[in-house]
């Protein structure tokens, strides 16, 4: 019962996590214009992995895709790659874990097979979550570096009269969504791995040791000891699970749609 619950919960948590990773990857607000000095702005800039956007105070929003591939920073390409790998691994993990769920019967699938599939999906979720966390963290580090660089030359004087204000960017909503989603996927993966241990049929050899007293007399000599031992046949202690006895309701979770402004 506890194993089924752990497995089911792990699946649901991972599902929410992967939905979050997909959402974060698609979101435009990975970096947003820093409004520390000017909380009310007429032009608000924000950027995602795939396009950059400008929201005017008039309400109009204009987004432009990054149509170049070679012209993009290597770090951005790396973040894209990490997020996509995370999504792909997570999606495969979800597919595998659906068939591994104890509450779903597929033909005469052995518990050992389900255990292996659960472990596989768990590892995939862990790697997926780590990819997402790594991707978001790399981007965040890039932002911090750029933030302090642009702060150092916030104003570039032109003839001592004209000022060019450099736009500084700070953490966008997508980073927090990505971190939380990656964490959830990671937790879900760990739960699946824990559930796998409970699913696996344990084959433990308990060697029964029997001591037989010898029929003939034993002469005890100083400094010496002799005893004969007889070993009985090994007995296998096998745990048996009643897989089909109980069925539990399948839990489905749908990611809610948020509008990040």
């Amino acid at each position: 019962m506890a194993v089924t619950a752990c497995q089911g919960l792990g699946f649901v948590v991972s599902l929410i996590g992967i939905a979050g990773i997909i959402a974060a990857t698609c979101m435009d607000q990975w970096s947003t214009q820093d409004l520390y000095n000017n909380p009310v702005t007429a032009v608000f800039n924000y950027q995602g992995l795939w396009r950059s956007c400008v929201r005017e105070s008039s309400g109009f929003t204009e987004c432009r895709g990054y149509f170049t591939l070679l012209g993009l920073p290597a770090m951005l390409q790396a973040v894209r790659a990490l997020m996509i790998v995370g999504i792909v691994l997570g999606a495969i993990g979800l597919l595998v874990s659906i068939f591994a769920l104890k509450c779903i019967r597929i033909g005469s699938m052995e518990d050992s097979a389900k255990a292996n599939m659960t472990l596989t999906s768990g590892i995939m979720f862990i790697v997926s979550g780590l990819c997402a966390i790594a991707g978001v963290s790399v981007f965040a580090n890039m932002l911090v570096t750029n933030f302090w660089m642009s702060t150092a030359n916030m104003y570039t004087g032109m003839g001592g009269m004209v000022q060019t204000v450099q736009t500084r960017y700070t953490f966008g909503a997508a980073l927090f969504v990505g971190w939380v989603a990656g964490g959830l996927t990671l937790i879900g993966g760990v739960m699946m791995c824990i559930a796998c241990r409970g699913l696996a049929p344990e084959e433990t050899n308990y060697k029964a040791v029997s001591y037989h007293a010898s029929g003939h007399s034993v002469a005890y000599k100083p400094g010496g000891f002799k005893a004969s031992t007889g070993f009985g046949s090994n007995t296998k202690n096998k745990k048996i699970y009643d897989g089909g006895a109980r069925t539990e309701d399948e839990v489905q979770s749908y990611p809610s749609k948020h509008d990040y402004v």
Epitope: V43, N45, V54, S58, G59, R64, V165
Partner: antibody
Amino acid sequence: QIQLVQSGAEVKKPGASVKISCKASGYSFTDYHMNWVRQAPGKGLEWIGNIDPYYGSPTYNHKFKGRVTLTVDTSTSTAYMELSSLRSEDTAVYYCANYGRGNSFPYWGQGTLVTVSS
Amino acid sequence: DIVMTQSPSSLAVSLGERATINCKSSQSLLNSGNQRNYLTWYQQKPGQPPKLLLYWASTRESGVPDRFSGSGSGTDFTLTISSLQAEDLAVYYCQNDYSFPFTFGQGTKLEIK
């Protein structure tokens, strides 16, 4: 088509308040901010502030902060601008103007002349 | 606040000739996010509200004749009327649309020589 119709001319005494209305038609009123601009006789244009009709949140030019209040009535698609503690230098034509692309003002009201005189 | 300075304050040009009005801002109006300059040009005739001519420094508003064109980037901008018509006689204003408070130039009065 989009139209912005403003209330009639006003004559006020110094220290008094004036409230000008701007009725919008031809578009969804809550979709676009309403800006207010004034022009003193023979002088240039001066931006007073704007208001988001959807949230009712205003943004003011700090020069007028504390004296100007921008409000909206979404049921009648009307924007209001109230200027208090009037001085003679507040004598001007007051315009309401709709927002467009590039934060520009493509649609303007006909203007309301406010005369402050003792 | 961003200060907008227009030059000249008045300009006399013959009909059919080219008219050029300059506008300088105390701060760059170029937005790095979309590489657009947030500068708008208006035309105002006596007794009328201003009329939008160009936004984003060079994008013509619909219905505006193509003899009106805008150029410039950052802090220096120009409004050009390629062939002056009688109906173009008015006061022209440039406006900062990049940061609050929005500010206007003092205006350039265009007259017939």
